[in-house]
């Protein structure tokens, strides 16, 4: 039975040109995390594999940085980055858990600074 839950950074509003940290944390399960995929719509952004480490999709290499932890840092944000992002936790023996974060990137100045979300 899947008992785990995913906690996310929550939805975020950010400024064009800035950077943002997307993070998820899987709790309430003893399942082993084998891989975490980060996706936007149907595009794979990055993979963090427990054995092989990080792989960033070539088309995002310039603007996506791994971490902190299992999270993902998006840099040089554009309005086109507005959308829903998914953290997909592949675990054994539970299976797959998915977290969802919506990111809104605005032209004008946005008062959201200083990420305080940390993986426990």
């Amino acid at each position: 039975m899947m008992t785990g839950t995913i906690e996310t950074t929550g939805n975020i509003s950010a400024e064009k040109g800035g950077s943002i940290i997307l993070q998820c944390h899987l709790s309430s399960t003893t399942a082993q995390v084998t891989q975490v995929n980060w996706e936007q719509q149907d595009q794979l952004l990055a993979i963090c594999n427990a054995d092989l480490g990080w792989h960033i999709s070539p088309s995002f290499k310039d603007r996506v940085a791994p971490g902190p932890g299992l999270g993902l840092t998006l840099q040089s944000l554009t309005v086109n980055d507005t959308g829903e992002y998914f953290c997909i936790y592949h675990t054994y023996p539970d299976g797959t858990y998915t977290g969802r974060i919506f990111l809104e990137v605005l032209e004008s100045s946005v008062a959201e600074h200083g990420a305080r979300f940390q993986i426990p």
Partner: antibody
Framework: EVQLQQSGPELVKPGASMKISCKAS????????MNWVKQSHGDNLEWIGL????????SYNLNFKGKASLTVDKSSSTAYMELLSLTSEDSAVYYC????????????WGQGTSVTVSS | DVVVTQTPLSLPVSFGDQVSISCRSS???????????LSWYLHKPGQSPQLLIY???NRFSGVPDRFSGSGSGTDFTLKISTIKPEDLGMYYC?????????FGGGTKLEIK
């Protein structure tokens, strides 16, 4: 003045599909997210999903995945919601609502479209 | 999904009364950047819902100052001082911090 003008009431048969339109005016259509909300069972409000007119990106309430399909026509500043394989459970009033920038709220709402599913 | 619970379900009032509506969420509505996306709406019969308060306590343009919002974390309140006839209807809170956004069940403000 911001306005969202929705299409008129619909009476449709079970199993059919239909499309509701929401024409936006008074602001730059591509600058704001468009949400869709269902009002059913008297007073219950349920978020269906949203679309980003700028890039066509969508986000759905999983309860409506496969039930609702959201699109936009930027040239006419119109958002659309197609409802698929309708049943009596889909009889409701449907609203489009503009997203308030920075605050994940809904600042302007359409007048609502009443959908009745009946044979 | 985040569960949003509103109380009371029904609120009988007299004109001139001051009332409070409570909205509680099953998890914190503060995101990792310290922002809380909690808004309040009034839905009058035969009309569309209208935004009253966003970001916990910000009044939307044109909303009278007898409406005020407060709270943090999981516990939020809408206060209406000096109830007027045009304030009657269904009140809803909406959390927009977590996907999918979820509404409270509503509070019906009606005359005693």
């Amino acid at each position: 003045e911001v306005q969202l003008q929705q299409s008129g009431p619909e009476l449709v048969k079970p199993g059919a599909s239909m499309k509701i339109s929401c024409k936006a005016s008074g602001y730059s259509f591509t600058d704001y997210i468009m949400n869709w909300v269902k009002q059913s069972h008297g007073d219950n409000l349920e978020w269906i999903g949203l679309i980003v007119p700028y890039n066509g990106g969508t986000s759905y309430n999983l309860n409506f995945k496969g039930k609702a399909s959201l699109t936009v026509d930027k040239s006419s500043s119109t958002a659309y919601m197609e409802l698929l394989s309708l049943t009596s459970e889909d009889s409701a009033v449907y609203y489009c609502a503009r997203g308030l920038q920075r605050f994940y709220a809904m600042d302007y709402w359409g007048q609502g479209t009443s959908v009745t599913v009946s044979s | 999904d985040v569960v949003v619970t509103q109380t009371p379900l029904s609120l009988p009032v007299s004109f001139g009364d001051q009332v409070s509506i409570s909205c509680r969420s099953s998890q914190s509505l503060e995101n990792s950047y310290g922002n809380t996306y909690l808004s309040w709406y009034l839905h009058k019969p035969g009309q569309s819902p209208q935004l009253l308060i966003y970001g916990i306590s910000n009044r939307f343009s044109g909303v009278p100052d007898r409406f005020s919002g407060s709270g943090s974390g999981t516990d939020f309140t809408l206060k209406i001082s000096t109830i007027k006839p045009e304030d009657l209807g269904m009140y809803y809170c909406l959390q927009g911090t977590h996907q999918p956004p979820t509404f409270g069940g509503g509070t019906k403000l009606e005359i005693k």
